[in-house]
């Protein structure tokens, strides 16, 4: 598993460095998660040919994965800091059930999958401290999440491989869009 943010060799070598700002910590946390996703995708791609599937083919799925849209205020046009931050936090909370699903999907990268899940929880906490309007953030319903998890786990092997690939790719794209937007805040 990659070294958690704040524990890399550079930090050890420079103990008197300025402490990270809130934005730097968030940036580092997202990149740490992205690194974890890359490692998980390597195992997924080695195991199945999902990674060769076209994006169009993958889009034909019934997963309701969080996605950035123009209305969310995170893009160049119509950028809105508060709306965007709410979307990022809400999206991350919605991804949590999918990250839970990933926990039993990896053999050699079990720790890595756990690290991605735990790091995402930490990222959500960081971002909630940054948000002014916490009331606007909708938390997913636990009962709905539980039945979704059961449904995903009941799929056949091929669909489970497809689901794993889609979750990782979508989560990566969501995090990248989030990081770009957060850089402007």
């Amino acid at each position: 598993a990659p070294v958690p943010p704040g524990e890399d060799s550079k930090d050890v070598a420079a103990p008197h460095r300025q402490p990270l700002t809130s934005s730097e910590r968030i940036d580092k946390q997202i990149r740490y998660i992205l690194d974890g996703i890359s490692a998980l995708r390597k195992e997924t791609c080695n195991k199945s040919n999902m990674c060769e599937s076209s994006k169009e083919a993958l889009a034909e799925n019934n997963l309701n994965l969080p996605k950035m849209a123009e209305k969310d205020g995170c893009f160049q046009s119509g950028f809105n800091e508060e709306t965007c931050l709410v979307k990022i936090i809400t999206g991350l909370l919605e991804f949590e059930v999918y990250l839970e699903y990933l926990q039993n999907r990896f053999e050699s990268s079990e720790e890595q999958a756990r690290a991605v899940q735990m790091s995402t929880k930490v990222l959500i906490q960081f971002l909630q401290k940054k948000a002014k309007n916490l009331d606007a953030i909708t938390t997913p319903d636990p009962t709905t999440n539980a039945s979704l998890l059961t449904k995903l786990q009941a799929q056949n092997q091929w669909l489970q491989d497809m689901t794993t690939h889609l979750i990782l790719r979508s989560f990566k794209e969501f995090l990248q869009s989030s990081l770009r937007a957060l850089r402007q805040m």
Partner: antibody
């Protein structure tokens, strides 16, 4: 020092598929956050972004070319490739490959190949 | 996918300052700090000059500077020299991992 070198046929017939390869030396194409783009320049005209393949092998294409373009890689050879189908004379251009050092928050190209001229003509 | 708009040509005499503008449509440039500038000499590949709006690439003299105001980015070259004569292109990130280039500007040193 990172170096990029384009290769492929200089002449392609209309309606055929244009295929180019970019060989990268001095660094791995799978290094984290790097991305590898194809950019073209018709004679006497400006630069046009075609598409990109990132450090995970994910691809993104220009909306205007999306239906005809495909970018892939061969990590064992440290190469990435461009395929453009159903070409017309309007696709005649110098084709460049280039590196983005940080696809997450970079969006700039610090290393370029020298470019290869492709003419579409029967 | 419409290109960013640049003036077709600008000119100046040695020692002067010139500014090349790069205007975005649909707020391409407005919010995000992902504008870069490239110099292209005849028959050669473009060369990175400025990235992230204001950061000079390695080895680029401080005569070259970048800025942004609203939906327009600018490249300023001060103390113009004969070897600065070239085509200049801006580029920007566009939503969904897309990039777009400017129309290009021919700089002539008189």
């Amino acid at each position: 020092e990172v170096q990029l070198q384009e290769s492929g046929p200089g002449l392609v017939k209309p309606s055929q598929t244009l295929s180019l390869t970019c060989t990268v030396s001095g660094g791995s194409i799978t290094s984290r956050y790097y991305a590898w783009s194809w950019i073209r320049q018709p004679p006497g005209k400006g630069l046009e972004w075609i598409g990109v393949i990132d450090y995970d092998g994910d691809t993104y294409y220009s909306p205007s070319l999306k239906s005809r373009v495909s970018i892939s890689w061969d990590t064992s050879k440290n190469q990435f490739s461009l395929k453009l189908s159903s070409v017309t004379p309007a696709d005649t251009a110098v084709y460049y490959c280039a590196r983005d050092p940080d696809v997450v928050t970079g969006f700039h190209y610090d290393y370029w190949g020298q470019g290869t001229m492709v003419t579409v003509s029967s | 996918q419409s290109a960013l708009t640049q003036p077709p040509s600008v000119s100046g005499t040695p020692g002067q300052s010139v500014t090349i503008s790069c205007a975005g449509a649909n707020n391409d440039i407005g919010t995000y700090a992902y504008v870069s500038w490239y110099q292209q000499l005849p028959g050669t590949a473009p060369k990175l000059m400025i990235y992230k709006v204001t950061t000079r690439a390695s080895g680029i003299p401080d005569r070259f500077s970048g800025s942004k105001s609203g939906n327009t980015a600018s490249l300023t070259i001060s103390g113009l020299q004969a070897e600065d004569e070239a085509d200049y292109y801006c580029a920007s990130y566009r939503n969904f991992n897309n990039a777009v280039f400017g129309t290009g500007t021919k700089l002539t040193v008189l």
